[in-house]
Interface confidence: low
């Protein structure tokens, strides 16, 4: 019996989380599934066979980055009912291909118990095309991340970018969390130089990257896929 790496992700109502999952191989179906209470099966939430579970349509995104051997699943407009146990995986059989367990906890306010975690303050995710920060702490097997509320508490320094047509003092609009088992501590603030780097290098390399308009790894995107092709059941 294989013991899966486990990740814990925290999100707030109305906010969003980004789950990082290992990508074991290319050209295979990858997915995020949700453990069904009672049945023990894992029902597909989103997969690369163009399936999205009905209650996640318009607010879930899957992007894969083969050169970094990972894929990202972003869930936006979080509700309390999104709390639960999920799993990343690869392969045509959802139940058998799981690679990482993900526990998502969605709540309206952060309980004091979270302040007791022996971890440095976790940087925030900002809903901005050019400004990314990665979580500052992770362990090899379990990970807990904390995010700020959609109505951000605390001040954000003004940042000037060369691309936006209006100069603005950036304030976060959507809270974000990102996690993967075994991720290393790192924080990024990109410069304004428009160099040609890949989105993943900008996200993952331990350096301060530069961004052009290709590197917008996380923008909140919600589309109504009126005609999804294919159906996926539980397993």
């Amino acid at each position: 019996l294989r013991i899966l790496p486990e990740v814990k992700v925290e999100g707030e109502l109305g906010g969003s989380v980004t789950i990082k999952c290992p990508l074991p191989e290319m050209h295979v179906r990858i997915y995020l599934c949700r453990e069904m209470a009672g049945s023990g099966t894992c029902g597909t939430v989103v997969s690369t066979t163009n399936f999205i579970k009905a209650e996640y349509k318009g607010r879930v995104t899957l992007k894969q980055y083969p050169r970094k051997n990972l894929f990202l699943v972003e869930v936006t407009q979080l509700t309390e009912s999104d709390s639960g146990v999920y799993a990343c995986g690869a392969g045509m059989n959802t139940d058998r291909g799981k690679t990482q367990k993900v526990t998502l906890n969605v709540h309206s306010e952060y309980e004091p118990s979270w302040e007791e975690q022996p971890m440095p303050e976790t940087p925030k995710w900002f809903h901005l095309p050019y400004l990314f920060q990665m979580p500052a702490y992770a362990s090899s097997s379990k990970f807990v991340t904390r995010v700020t509320t959609p109505a951000q508490r605390g001040k954000v320094p003004p940042v000037h970018h060369s691309s936006p047509t209006t100069q603005i003092t950036h304030r976060p609009r959507v809270s974000r969390a990102s996690s993967v088992a075994g991720d290393k501590p790192r924080t990024f603030l990109p410069s304004t130089t428009a160099s040609k780097i890949s989105a993943l290098e900008g996200l993952l390399k331990p350096q301060t990257p530069s961004y052009n308009h290709h590197t917008r790894l996380h923008r909140q995107r919600a589309l109504d896929y009126g005609s999804q092709s294919g159906r996926e059941g539980q397993g």
Epitope: M26, H27, R29, V46, S47, T48, T49, N50, I52, Y56, K57, G58, R59, V60, T61, L62, K63, Q64, Y65, P66, R67, V73, E74, T76, P129, P164, T165, T166, S198, A199, H213, H214, R216, L217, R219, Q220, R221, A222, L223, D224, Y225, G226, S227, S229
Partner: antibody
């Protein structure tokens, strides 16, 4: 950067078929979703189809569903559009387009940051 | 599908003047709107994405604004290369749709 060169256009009779190709360069092809946009003479652009970086996900506008098929060969950095049951309404300049990144799921389409120069498809008897 | 209506259909201006182009969506596209410029015999070129962000290599005299259903492309001082047709495009809903275009011509 990035460049795309389309080929395969030409004159075809109504009901006929054509296969368009797009040879891309200057970027990591498999990392980016690609698409086709067409433009009839004197009209604005019309999005036709898109395909994810792996080729596992495809998307079509309503008027071409069931007639057109988009595919890609990442080993050759090439994308294709197989067009069947062509009609006069399909007459247009067909552009190969590149999206800024790969995409799947519900929040995943984009603008087009690079376009080829187009290949002309004329459907006429 | 979302219909994008551009106005005016034609804008007659002189070099150095300010151009203001409008794009109105039949329903909200939030900030997910792009602008392209197309010169005769050329493919469209991305100018602005997500309503306000300039694409690589686009000069500061070109700017975008708006959200929801009403968007504006502004060229603060027209240069010779700006006389072309401009299209808006939304990516908020499938199918992706373009506006009918605004032609900016030399007066």
């Amino acid at each position: 950067g990035g460049a795309a060169v389309e080929s395969g256009g030409g004159l075809v009779q109504p009901g006929g078929s054509l296969r368009l190709s797009c040879a891309a360069s200057g970027f990591t092809f498999s990392d980016c979703a690609m698409g086709w946009v067409r433009q009839a003479p004197g009209k604005g652009p019309e999005w036709v189809a898109a395909i994810s970086g792996s080729g596992l996900s495809t998307y079509y506008t309503g008027s071409v569903k069931g007639r057109f098929s988009i595919s890609r060969d990442n080993s050759k950095s090439t994308m294709f559009l197989q067009m069947d049951s062509l009609s006069a309404g399909d007459t247009a300049l067909y552009y190969c387009t590149k999206a800024p990144w790969d995409y799947y799921g519900s929040g995943n389409t984009d603008h087009f940051d690079h376009w080829g120069q187009g290949t002309l498809v004329t459907v006429s008897s | 599908e979302i219909v994008l209506t551009q106005s005016p259909a034609t804008l007659s201006l002189s070099p150095g003047e300010r151009a203001t182009l409008s794009c109105r969506a039949s329903q909200s596209v939030r900030s997910y709107l792009a602008w392209y410029r197309q010169r005769p015999g050329q493919a469209p070129r991305l100018l602005i994405y997500d309503a306000t962000y300039r694409a690589a290599g686009i000069p500061a005299r070109i700017s975008g604004s708006g959200s929801g259903t009403d968007f504006t492309l502004t060229i603060s001082s027209l240069e010779p290369e700006d006389f072309a047709v401009y299209y808006c495009q939304q990516r908020n809903n499938w199918p992706l749709t373009f506006g009918g275009g605004t032609k900016v011509e030399i007066r």
